[in-house]
Structures are given as structure tokens and as C-alpha cells.
Interface confidence: low
């Protein structure tokens, strides 16, 4: 008769570092001792007629149990194989680019450490909850790629991978871990520069605007912006419309830059650099400063009128040009009372880069001079008629401008001048008319004839 | 830490040339302007120039200008002055130093290097 | 070129008194967006100038508050308040408003 030893469970299944009871059991009436065989850390629990109880500890990989016993003289077997599974200890998805190009492949790449039994094992790398790639986990550590072609839409997008272990054949489910997530930024940047809009030229100490636009810049708002001139950093302010991003800051020339210098506006974006430079040239352009040597002459007196400017200016007083740029125009004139509120001009004309800057600046020369009635304005007879409407058109002269009056010879009586008033023959006389100013008095005598009013 | 640190002395014969450097560290070199100055017993300090190491853009004390040369390496973070026919009156401690853009103080100065001309 | 002019050539002082060094330019170191750009430097012997003030009144990071400037235009002044050995040096005034930037000649603090 041919007698069995049986061994329980048979191929179980359990997690790693676990612990097992196995039981060895015969049906043969004159078995001897049954005796486990196998490298686990083993201890005997019980043993009785035809049967003995194990306890398995620490069970941390694959085994094959075998139980044995003697039984009339004839050695009988019985074995188990024990399937052992753990979950991985590391699942890592690797950094992704700082910043990624869109329309460029990149590959995404998962390490995982560990885990059992690999025939069991999956790894899945995922886009949000998408799966990009789904394989098996093969040698250790595992390592699992997939390129991605990078879109817009991917900016900001989270990538990670996970592990299934599939024990549901055993009746234990489905194990799963997931690595940290890492978000993706993708960015494009044309291969133009930008456009940067700034004056050719730049006088000293005045500003002007500058503007550097790019335009299919994504995301925009992440663009860095540098504008300078020559060493000097602009404060630039940063406008994002859509995929353009437009800078724009005030230039302010220095008098320590002078001479031909290089606007500069960068963009960075995604560790790339697009580069627009503009010359410039700083100039310096004071004046034309024109000068009286006395602002208020005396009539008679020698005034000089002078003009001067910056270095390599040419100026051109009243039409007179300098002798050379650089220099000073000047001219003198013996003050007359005709020179009273004359205005003296100056042009200043500069050379920068092939092109002619003008400038203008006047100034007036007041003469002083005595008062004077003009002689063509008042008529010394006049002829009026008794009741009518007239104007004595007296004009008086003189800087300071004077007073003018118009008083009857031996009376207090006054006429106005210069405004509308009825005539009558109380007017008829000889008048004083007298320009009286600071610098002295002028009199001409103006007799009014006036004909009585006839009723016939 | 901020540091600029100088190459060592030199002692070289009149008529040539030498080229002293100045390796920035702790900051990024390309934010800052590099300044080179002189210092000699009888003069003083003196200032010889400034060089911009992001575009490499250069400012001379005219009394340098064709004696002293700046350069820069930004891959190495280096600032180089080279000083040409060489004389005993170019004999002195130089030092590089940065400042923030214009125009303000020297912020961080080398530990100088020292140039004696003698045949 | 602005030139500036220190004085006193040599300042001794007894530790715990209060010094002051004056500095003059040539020309007004005021620059055209306001600012005036005149710093003090002090060179410890044997070592390189340090930065104590910054645009005439400005105390640099890690300079005590016994270092005090004022001035403008052209005529500037360091304050210490209390000298203590380790302010031993000489002091330079320097001015970046002008192309060159120019150094004054230098004060030197010593132990009467």
C-alpha cells in the first residue's frame, strides 16, 4: 500500500519578512519522526502520532518547503512552494527639464526598487490621470521610459508614475503606489529678436521713451525682460497681451555718456535669450545762450549782444555766424531810442551723426530814452466844430512810456487824448500838451479853433 | 559669501606686460560692474576703469586708456586687466572691486594684487 | 576731474574720543537725478579699503553705528563717535558722480 505525506497550505501566498504555520501529516500507521526541510528560520510548534507542526518566520523571499518521513523502511516526501510578495520601496519619476520646448520630445523616466513578484508588476506613467506608457517592471531596480511630445497644453501639467502588483489571481487585490508628482512647464520663444523702438539720438539729462515687443512668446508672463543703456539697467515696465509681452521704460541720458552707446533689450524665457540692440548717440547741446552786456541800456550807450553755445555748436547771431563752432557770435551797437524792444536771434545748429540739430533763443534790449510826442500824430492847429464828436490823436513816446496830458494855458482844464470827447467852444484855447516821464519832459502846444455852432 | 579673489604678485621687467585676474564668487558676476583701481605710495588710490560683464562693456580713466585693458570671462566668472609696456611707475597694489549698477559705492574690494616693474 | 581734498592728513585720538575728517570736491558732486554719490572707504594696514558709508549718510551692511556722514555739494564730513582699536586706518573720501571717479588723499587715525 502506498502511503501519502501531505504538507499544509499548500503554495500559499504571504507578504514580506511574514511568518508561517506549516502542518506535515501521513497516513502511515508506523510512520517515524517527520522531519521539515528548508533554509527559513523554522521552529516545531507540535508533533504527534503521524503528524508535526512548523512555524516559518521571517519569510522574506521565494521557498520551497519539503517534509519528509520514514515510513516502513521506504523515505516519503511531500513539498510546498511558498510565493512571497512586497511592494516596491522607491517609485521615482525623474526631474523633468527646467523648462521644455514646445514640439521637442522629452522623456519622462521611473525607477522603482523593489518589489514582488516581478511577474506580477506593472509600471504606468500618467499625464494628469492619462497613461502614457504602461509596461512590465524587469531587472532591479526597474526602469521604465516614454518620450512626450511637449504642447502648449502640457505647461503645468503634473507627470507621475505608479506601480500596480496584480495579486488578485491569489485573492489578495490589486497592490498600487505612486511617486511624487512633477510638474512640466513648456515654453516657446521665437526665433526673431524682439523689436526695440528707441531714438536715434538722446540729449544729455533728457528722457525718452523706449519699446521692446516680442510677439509668439508662451507663457509670456514667465518672460524675463532686461532694457539698458550702455551699463545702465532700465526700470522697465512689463505688459503681457496674449503670447506678446511689450517693455517699455524711460531713457535718461547721463553726461558721463556721451558719445555713441548701444540700447540692448533682452528677453529671457526657458534658460533662452532673444537680443535686440539699437545705436544711439548721447549728446550734449546747451544753449544758445544769448547775452546783453546791459538788458536795459541807456539810449547812446554801447551794448554788446552775445551768443555762445556748447562745445562743436555753431552759432549765428542776427545772421552773423562765429568764427568757428565752439566759439562765441557777438555783436555791439551804440543803443538808440529805434533800438528800444529790439529783438536779437540766435541759431545754434549741431552736427550728430550726419544730422543738423537746430536750436533758437532771443532776447529783447529795452533802450531808455526821454519822451517825445510825435509831431505826425498831433496836429498843433485844429479846426473843430462847436457840438461835435472828436479825438485828439496825441501819441507820446519814451521808455519808461510816459504820461501824456493836455492842459489849456492859464486854466486847470484838461482834454482827454486819445478817446472820443464832445467839443464845445468852451475848448477853444491853446492847450499844453506835456509827455512826462522819469527820464524828463517833452511839450508841444496844440491850439483848438472852435467855430460856434450857427442856427441859420 | 561675496568674494573677489586676486591673482598673486608679480614682478616683471620694464617694457613688458602682465595680465592680473579676479575671480568673483557668491553672487551672480553678471549683475554687478567690475572696478579696477590703483595704489601706489606716492599717488594714492586711483581709478582705473569699469567693465560691464554682461556685455563686456568698458569705461576708462583716460590717464589708463592705452595702458589698461579690461576683459572679462563670464563662463569662469573672471575679471582680467592687463597693464602694456610696463615701467617703475606702474609699480603698485591693484585691486579689483564691484559695485551695483550706477553708480554706487565699491561694495566688495580683492585683496589686491602687487606689481613691481624692476629690470 | 573732481578733485577731492582731505583733511586732517593725520588725526591721533585717544580710544573713546570723537573724531571727525572733512572732505571737499572741486565741484558739486551732485548728480543730475538727485543723488550724490560721495562714499567713505578705511584701509586697515596691511589690508584692502572697506566700505563704511555709502552716498554721503548710508551706513554699508555690518559698519557700526559709531560711523556717521554728512555733507553736500561739495563739502562732506565722517563722524566716529567713539574710536575704538579696530578703527585704526586710514580713511579715504571717494566720489562715482563724475567720469573719473576720484579718491581723496587719504586720513590717517592713530593712537595719540
Known amino acids: 500500500q502506498e502511503f501519502l505525506l501531505r504538507v499544509e497550505p499548500q503554495n500559499p501566498v504571504l507578504s514580506a519578512g511574514g511568518s508561517l504555520f506549516v502542518n506535515c501529516s501521513t497516513d502511515c500507521p508506523s510512520s517515524e519522526k517527520i522531519a521539515l526541510e528548508t533554509s527559513l528560520s523554522k521552529a516545531l510548534v507540535a508533533s504527534g502520532m503521524g503528524w508535526a507542526a512548523f512555524n516559518l518566520s521571517n519569510v522574506t523571499g521565494n521557498s520551497r518547503i519539503l517534509c519528509s518521513v520514514y515510513c516502513n523502511g521506504s523515505q516519503i516526501t511531500g513539498s510546498s512552494n511558498i510565493t512571497v510578495y512586497g511592494l516596491p520601496e522607491r517609485v521615482e519619476l525623474a526631474p523633468l527639464p527646467p523648462w521644455q520646448p514646445v514640439g521637442q520630445n522629452f522623456t519622462l523616466r521611473c525607477q522603482v526598487e523593489g518589489g514582488s513578484p516581478r511577474t506580477s508588476l506593472t509600471v504606468v506613467l500618467l499625464r494628469w490621470e492619462e497613461e502614457l506608457s504602461r509596461q512590465p517592471a524587469v531587472e532591479e531596480p526597474a526602469e521604465v521610459t516614454a518620450t512626450v511630445l511637449a504642447s502648449r497644453d502640457d505647461h503645468g501639467a503634473p507627470f507621475s508614475c505608479r506601480t500596480e502588483l496584480d495579486m488578485q489571481p491569489q485573492g489578495l487585490g490589486l497592490f498600487v503606489n505612486t511617486s511624487a508628482p512633477r510638474q512640466l512647464r513648456t515654453f516657446v520663444l521665437p526665433v526673431t529678436p524682439p523689436r526695440l523702438v528707441a531714438p536715434r539720438f538722446l540729449e544729455v539729462e533728457t528722457s525718452w521713451p523706449v519699446d521692446c515687443t516680442l510677439d509668439g512668446l508662451f507663457p509670456a508672463s514667465e518672460a524675463q525682460v532686461y532694457l539698458a543703456l550702455g551699463d545702465q539697467m532700465l526700470n522697465a515696465t512689463v505688459m503681457n497681451h496674449g503670447d506678446t509681452l511689450t517693455a517699455t521704460a524711460t531713457a535718461t541720458a547721463r553726461a558721463d555718456q556721451e558719445g555713441a552707446r548701444e540700447i540692448v533689450c533682452n528677453v529671457t524665457l526657458g534658460g533662452e535669450r532673444r537680443e535686440a540692440r539699437e545705436n544711439l548717440t548721447v549728446f550734449s547741446f546747451l544753449g544758445p545762450i544769448v547775452n546783453l552786456s546791459e538788458p536795459t541800456a541807456h539810449e547812446g550807450s554801447t551794448v554788446t549782444v552775445s551768443c555762445m553755445a556748447g562745445a562743436r555748436v555753431q552759432v549765428t547771431l542776427d545772421g552773423v555766424p562765429a568764427a568757428a563752432p565752439g566759439q562765441t557770435a557777438q555783436l555791439q551797437l551804440n543803443a538808440t531810442e529805434s533800438d528800444d524792444g529790439r529783438s536779437f536771434f540766435c541759431s545754434a545748429t549741431l552736427e550728430v551723426d550726419g544730422e543738423f540739430l537746430h536750436r533758437n533763443s532771443s532776447v529783447q534790449l529795452r533802450v531808455l530814452y526821454g519822451p517825445k510826442i510825435d509831431r505826425a500824430t498831433c496836429p498843433q492847429h485844429l479846426k473843430w466844430k462847436d457840438k461835435t464828436r472828436h479825438v485828439l490823436q496825441c501819441q507820446a513816446r519814451g521808455n519808461p512810456y510816459p504820461e501824456l496830458r493836455c492842459l489849456k494855458e492859464g486854466s486847470s482844464r484838461e482834454v482827454p487824448v486819445g478817446i472820443p470827447f464832445f467839443v464845445n467852444v468852451t475848448h477853444n484855447g491853446t492847450y499844453q500838451c506835456q509827455a512826462s516821464s522819469s527820464r524828463g519832459k517833452y511839450t508841444l502846444v496844440v491850439v483848438m479853433d472852435i467855430e460856434a455852432f450857427s442856427s441859420h | 559669501e561675496i568674494q573677489l579673489q586676486q591673482t598673486g604678485p608679480e614682478l616683471v621687467k620694464p617694457g613688458a606686460s602682465v595680465k592680473i585676474s579676479c575671480k568673483a564668487s557668491?553672487?551672480?558676476?553678471?549683475?554687478?560692474?567690475i572696478l579696477w583701481v590703483k595704489q601706489s605710495h606716492g599717488k594714492g588710490l586711483e581709478w582705473i576703469g569699469k567693465?560691464?560683464?554682461?556685455?563686456?562693456?568698458?569705461t576708462y580713466n583716460l590717464k589708463f586708456k592705452g595702458k589698461a585693458t579690461l576683459t572679462v570671462d563670464k563662463s569662469s566668472s573672471t575679471a582680467h586687466m592687463q597693464l602694456n609696456s610696463l615701467t617703475s611707475e606702474d609699480s603698485a597694489v591693484y585691486y579689483c572691486?564691484?559695485?551695483?549698477?550706477?553708480?554706487?559705492?565699491?561694495?566688495?574690494w580683492g585683496q589686491g594684487t602687487s606689481v613691481t616693474v624692476s629690470s | 576731474d573732481a578733485v577731492m581734498t582731505q583733511t586732517p592728513l593725520s588725526l591721533p585720538v585717544s580710544l573713546g574720543d570723537q573724531a571727525s575728517i572733512s572732505c571737499r570736491s572741486s565741484?558739486?558732486?551732485?548728480?543730475?537725478?538727485?543723488?550724490?554719490?560721495l562714499h567713505w572707504y578705511l584701509q586697515k594696514p596691511g589690508q584692502s579699503p572697506q566700505l563704511l558709508i555709502y552716498?554721503?549718510?548710508n551706513r554699508f551692511s555690518g559698519v557700526p553705528d559709531r560711523f556717521s556722514g554728512s555733507g553736500s555739494g561739495t563739502d562732506f564730513t565722517l563722524k566716529l563717535s567713539r574710536v575704538e582699536a579696530e578703527d585704526l586706518g586710514v580713511y579715504f573720501c571717494?566720489?562715482?558722480?563724475?567720469?573719473?571717479?576720484?579718491f581723496g588723499g587719504g586720513t590717517k587715525l592713530e593712537i595719540k
Open positions: 571717494s566720489q562715482s558722480t563724475h567720469v573719473p571717479y576720484t
Open positions: 567693465i560691464n560683464p554682461y556685455f563686456g562693456t568698458t
Open positions: 565741484q558739486s558732486l551732485v548728480h543730475s537725478n538727485g543723488d550724490t554719490y
Open positions: 572691486a564691484r559695485k551695483e549698477a550706477y553708480p554706487d559705492a565699491m561694495d566688495y
Open positions: 557668491g553672487y551672480s558676476f553678471t549683475d554687478c560692474i
Open positions: 552716498k554721503v549718510s
